[in-house]
């Protein structure tokens, strides 16, 4: 019986530890996509509607803030699209990029952790164009560090929650 009690306590401890594991999945706020034709920071994301969720991390001022030291898996998916009903592209040669950046407040510094993308030729003869970027990686993050997303040509972002999103989840503690 003691073994059973110990076992259930162990399960509970494991479960509560899992429940405390930080994670975030943030989806683009389509009502507030910034303008610009060069690299801009995306600061408006949902954290509590549709597929978006957050636990034991903080979303503030457009940045995802780490609350616990640890090794995290970071990911971002960015979709760009253009349909002729919205008008024409002013240029057919495009650089479509995403940058995942870490900012440290304690020691003021900023580092690009991941970038992805391509130069594209989107011909004016086509009715529809689409391009998707997915980046992901494993990083040591400290409490207080902030993760943000920058993209080129935000006016071409696909505003759907299944198209433009980023997130993080803690994989293990720092030894």
């Amino acid at each position: 019986e003691k073994a059973m009690v110990d076992g259930s306590w162990l399960d509970l401890a494991k479960r509560s530890k899992l429940e405390a594991q930080p994670f975030a999945h943030l989806t683009i706020n389509a009502t507030d996509i910034p303008s610009g034709s060069h690299k801009v920071s995306l600061s408006s994301w949902y954290h509590d509607r549709g597929w978006a969720k957050i636990s034991n991390m903080t979303f503030s001022n457009g940045k995802l803030i780490v609350n616990q030291d640890g090794f995290y898996y970071l990911y971002a998916n960015i979709c760009f699209r253009h349909h002729e009903t919205s008008g024409d592209l002013a240029t057919e040669y495009l650089q479509l990029m995403v940058y995942v950046t870490k900012t440290s407040i304690k020691i003021p510094s900023s580092h690009t952790l991941m970038k992805g993308g391509s130069t594209k030729y989107w011909s004016g003869n086509s009715e529809f164009h689409f391009y998707s970027i997915n980046v992901g990686g494993f990083f040591k993050l400290r409490s207080g560090e902030e993760i943000s997303i920058e993209v080129s040509n935000p006016s071409l972002l696909d505003p759907d929650q299944d198209a433009t999103y980023f997130g993080a989840f803690k994989v293990r503690d720092i030894d």
């Epitope: 034709s37 253009h82 009903t85 919205s86 002013a90 240029t91 040509n153 935000p154």
Partner: antibody, heavy 126, light 103 residues
């Protein structure tokens, strides 16, 4: 204030060419696209083409492809539309119009014509 | 190629009347629809863009609505200076125009 001032009326014989100018003032010419639109007597408005004043890129209606040229002189803040091989059905009022989309804020030419020139009457007659 | 069709082609109304002009697209164009006012010998004027956004400087008696393939321009209280031809437009395609006159 934003203004587009076009050149004066022209009379041409069939087969000739005409070049209409559109001088912009009151805004940064290079940050916007200029469209050319015409209206023949009793007809609807008809889009002809655009030029991105910043990089010189152009796009034309299939109907005018091969006989239209649109250029710009950024130093003079002026756009030009030349139509060649004129025929009587090209008799129309030709307008230049600015696209509402600012190229600094994005790269979509939205076809929202927020400011127009006063129009240039081109008459093609033998 | 998208075709824009306006109705009616002309109308006559009294000062103060509510006037409605309809524009149909041959396929869905979301909300990418603009309305212009044309008066003889004058530069055309953008009234409404993006189906319902009022261009700055345009009187609030003008309003636009609709999405998909059907759109409406409404003049809530017709004024003598509103005598003109009105055109709907989606990118490269214009409607055939609606001539508005005073009774």
């Amino acid at each position: 204030q934003v203004q587009l001032v076009q050149s004066g009326a022209e009379v041409r014989k069939p087969g000739a060419s005409v070049k209409v100018s559109c001088k912009a003032s009151g805004y940064d010419f290079s940050n916007y696209a200029i469209h050319w639109v015409r209206q023949a007597p009793g007809q609807r408005l008809e889009w002809m083409g655009w030029i991105n004043a910043g990089n010189g890129n152009t796009k034309f209606s299939q109907k005018f492809q091969g006989r239209i040229t649109v250029t710009r002189d950024t130093a003079a803040s002026t756009a030009y539309m030349e139509l060649r091989s004129l025929r009587s059905e090209d008799t129309a009022v030709y307008y230049c119009a600015r696209d509402l989309s600012n190229m600094v804020r994005g790269i979509i030419i939205a076809y929202y014509f927020d400011y127009w020139g006063q129009g240039t009457l081109v008459t093609v007659s033998s | 190629e998208i075709v824009m069709t306006q109705s009616p082609s002309s109308l006559s109304a009294s000062v103060g009347d509510r006037v409605t002009i309809t524009c149909r697209a041959s396929q869905s164009i979301s909300r990418y629809l603009n309305w212009y006012q044309l008066k003889p010998g004058k530069a055309p004027r953008l009234l409404i863009y993006g189906a319902s956004s009022l261009q700055s400087g345009v009187p609030s008696r003008f309003s636009g609505s609709g999405s998909g393939a059907e759109f409406t321009l409404t003049i809530s209280s017709l004024q003598p200076e509103d005598i003109a031809t009105y055109y709907c437009q989606h990118t490269r395609a214009f409607g055939q125009g609606t001539k508005v006159e005073i009774k």
